[in-house]
Each structure stands twice: as structure tokens, then as C-alpha cells.
Amino acid sequence: KVILDKYYFLCGQPLHFIPRKQLCDGELDCPLGEDEEHCVKSFPEGPAVAVRLSKDRSTLQVLDSATGNWFSACFDNFTEALAETACRQMGYSSKPTFRAVEIGPDQDLDVVEITENSQELRMRNSSGPCLSGSLVSLHCLACGKSLKTPRVVGVEEASVDSWPWQVSIQYDKQHVCGGSILDPHWVLTAAHCFRKHTDVFNWKVRAGSDKLGSFPSLAVAKIIIIEFNPMYPKDNDIALMKLQFPLTFSGTVRPICLPFFDEELTPATPLWIIGWGFTKQNGGKMSDILLQASVQVIDSTRCNADDAYQGEVTEKMMCAGIPEGGVDTCQGDSGGPLMYQSDQWHVVGIVSWGYGCGGPSTPGVYTKVSAYLNWIYNVWKAEL
């Protein structure tokens, strides 16, 4: 049975086996086409999600689709039902929390009272000014909190207590990529992890440990990527994995927060990377133990210089490393998080590509997660 499962796939009606390599090859080899059903699926960028959260205390903003203008949500008459609607618009299914925060002097968007129409937030027609003088601070999910704070050093062994959202993504029980837990159903990783194997069956996720292979595997229901853009072949290196059963959160299994839409990180901002990847470029082996390292944002202009990536780093990517080189992600770290700590930990990047590992002029290149928030929300909404 194990050998059959490894090399063959069972078609139904009539029952017969086909070689597993014929799964997800674009050809209907089973009469009912089920060999092309459980494959990596692409999902378009989709329409603009009309709500978003700002780095200014996670305050809620709402889009006026008629004008294309964004407005901050006033706390006047804001309710739990409205909070739930806002979070559902972003694809969250958990119970949100919200509070009033005072409007600051640098508030630049106008502030409006919010109402609901057809399960979407709307600006209240002819609402008065914001009498409370407060905005809505909204949290759709408790995220980005770990039991232990890492020490700031170069590279060291990591504890799952520090990074409870880190997962190992495995094919046929072999570690292929890292990933991050975003909520009980969803894991964030890189699309290029699935280039070789596009069938969902043999992919598994392992969560809750810092040692490879020492923790139970979780079945995957769906793997979703963005449609390929031939104009920018390295763009869109992002994937969402939907788990067959929701995770139960604990001290060692917790979600990381998505970044805010306006999370602009300036050069030299400290960040963290983690993974079980190669410890040496072009050699060595996967690390059995999770490793962590502190890096920093590297200016995109510097990263695109003639002695570096020569313009290949697009607006939807970011660079991180240390100016002198030597600390970087490598093969096997792909898909893992590039993390920023404010009040909580946020996954601002996904380990994507680079030339070599740890070179001074060619730091790691990461998918900029804030550029894909709309896509993430649209995927989640479609799967609610």
C-alpha cells in the first residue's frame, strides 16, 4: 500500500491506477479528471478590499469606492458586529477585538462614522463629525506574540518558544521550505517551493518544534499561488497553504501578524530571519535545528546597483542582510518569514531568492508581504 501510494494514484469510476507523475500535469488522465483536482491552484489578485489596517495603532480605514478615497473609522456608534464585518471583509473568521484610540494631531485622513450594508462596511451618509475624537483600533486575530524574545546576535540556534509560527513544509517527508502560520487554517510560504511538485497530496506541514522531523505532520487541503506574470518572472513569489484541519494554538504553535498596509521599513531597520536551510552555500546540509539571525533592511537602490541585482529587485520585493555580508537565508529557508517586531511580530517578507548566500553585495531578496495583502484577503474571503 505504501509503495502503491508513493508511485501511483487511484482513479475512481472505473477504479484504476495511474503513475503519480501524471498528477497535475495539465492532462486529464482519470476519466473524471480527479488527477487534476488536488493541485496547486492560481488565484487572481482580485478587486480592492475596501477595508485596511494602519500601522498607527492598527486603526481601521474604509474605502469610499465612489471617489477612491480612504477614510479613518470614527469610534462613534462602532459595534462588535461592525468589527466582525470588517474582519470578515479581510477574510478572518476569528472573533475580533477593538477599542477607541484618540485621534492624533498628524491624522491626515478624514474621519467618518461607519455603518454596514450587504456585509460590507460603508461610510454613514451625511454623518456628522467624529464627536468622540477617537478612531477604531481593530485586531482581527491575536497574533505575533511569543513566549521568548530572541537575543540580538549574529546567528544562533533558535527555540520554538521564540518563533511559534515557524513551520517546516515537507514533500514526501523531506523538508523543502519554511513557512509561517497566519491563522488556524492558513500557512504563508513562497510559490517557488511548489515548482517541482504541484500535487497537493504529498505536501505536509510540521508545526510546533524547532527540530526537523520531530513533530507530527498536518495534511494540506489547498495550495494557492498568484497567476504568473511573465513581465516580472520573479514577482509574485507567494503562496498560501490551507490546512485540512484547523490548528490548535499553544505556546509553541501561534500565528504571526500580517504587516500593516503602510508598513514602510526604512534602511537599517532591524529584522529577523529563521530557517532550517543550508548553513553553507553550495554544500553542507540542512540544519536539523532551527537557526535564527538578525539582519537589517537594505535600501532597494543599493540592492539594485550594478554590482548587485542590477534592477531585478522590483517594488514588490525587499532586500535584507548585513552590509558586510555573511548573514543570510539560503536553500531550504525559502518560504520562511522575514520578521519585524513592533508591538507584535509581523511577517514583512518571505524568503524568495538571491545570488549565493551571504555575499556582501548580494543580500537576500524577499517577497514584500504588504504588496500582497489584497491578494491574501481575497483568497481568504473566497475560502471562508
Epitope: 494631531p105 498628524d106 491624522q107 478624514d110 467618518v112 451625511s126 454623518s127 456628522g128 463629525p129
Partner: antibody, heavy 120, light 107 residues
Framework: QVQLVQSGAEVKKPGASVKVSCKAS????????MHWVRQAPGQGLEWMGI????????SYAQKFQGRVTMTRDTSTSTVYMELSSLRSEDTAVYYC?????????????WGQGTLVTVSS | DIQMTQSPSSLSASVGDRVTITCRAS??????LAWYQQKPGKAPKLLIY???SLQSGVPSRFSGSGSGTDFTLTISSLQPEDFATYYC?????????FGQGTRLEIK
Amino acid sequence: QVQLVQSGAEVKKPGASVKVSCKASGYTFTTYYMHWVRQAPGQGLEWMGIINPSGGSTSYAQKFQGRVTMTRDTSTSTVYMELSSLRSEDTAVYYCARGRSWYRSNVDYWGQGTLVTVSS
Amino acid sequence: DIQMTQSPSSLSASVGDRVTITCRASQSISSWLAWYQQKPGKAPKLLIYAASSLQSGVPSRFSGSGSGTDFTLTISSLQPEDFATYYCQQSYSTPRTFGQGTRLEIK
């Protein structure tokens, strides 16, 4: 675009009242506060008070309390400022000015001003 | 009431000069401060809000700084159209109060 158009110049006798209007357009009238500010000839700016065009509530500077009344008409998107018991030192240009959509916000748009001359 | 004191009351400068005007509040107003420019016979125009945020459409040679009680407006390189009177205003509490103004003249 946002526009605040004020009524024309007035000449009044001491002890009389004046009512200046300010018609707003180009934005949702009820969402933004309206301030009144005056400027005597060759002098600086002096804040008189604020009105919430949605509910009609007001707050006046102590100096004008009892003499000033600010009202609004939402059907015509117009605010009014009436100043009574006029004296010669009330001769000034009176401006309406739009506040943003929260109380502590600054003023971002101004009317063109209405000159009120108080003279016997 | 919060008193706003501007200095200097007037100053003469030349095109291309860097000019700084200061505004002091009688108590802390956090960053609830705006700067306005007024030309003769015209209504004031908002330049800076929240002490340092540039209003849309205002040239970048204008900048503001400060918080608490001490604030400055800086014009990095004076242009002919910048000769006017400048006012600061606090919006921290009612009544909103203005500074007495700074008249900027051509030297």
C-alpha cells in the same frame, strides 16, 4: 473642489446686529466643523467659535459669549454667524473656515472674508 | 486660555535666504499646531499642520518642527511669493488661539 462663499460687506451702526452667511460646497457639509475667525484692520487673527453643522452644537470664545450666535441650515449647506450689540471695535473682516472631521483638527479651507464696518 | 507668542514680530530677508520663525505656547499642546500664511487682502492659507506635516500642494521649502511648547517654521530658500504674514495656531484646546503674527518683508 471645496469652496466657502461668504455674504457681502456690511456697514452697521453701534448697537445693531449683523448676520454673515457662509455657503459651503464641494464636500459633505455635515461631516466637517466650521469655525469663525475675525481680523481687525492691521491686526492679527482672532478665533470666535465653532459649530458642528450636523447637530448644530456650538462652542464660543469667552470674549464673544452672549453676543455671538452660530447657526446652520443643512438644506442649503450654509452656516451663519450673528454678532449683536455691535461696537466700533467689532469692525473687522470675518472669515468662516472649515475644520476637519474631528474637533481638535486644524482649519484647512477659508472663505474669502466679509468686511463688517461699525460706524455711527 | 493658551497664549501663543511668535517671534520675531517682523523680519526682513532676501530671496534665497533661510528664514526661521518661532512660536511658543504657554502650556504643552503636544503637536496640535498649525502654521498659516496670509497675504494682504486675502484669507489665510494652511501651510503646516500637526507641527511638522506639510499640507498638500504646499512647496517643500516650508517645514515645521517642535512639540510641547516650542515650535518653528522654516523656509529653506525664500522665494518672492513667500513675503507675507505668518501665524501659528493651537488646536489643542478651546478657545483656539493664534500667535500675533510675523511679518516677513523684502530686505
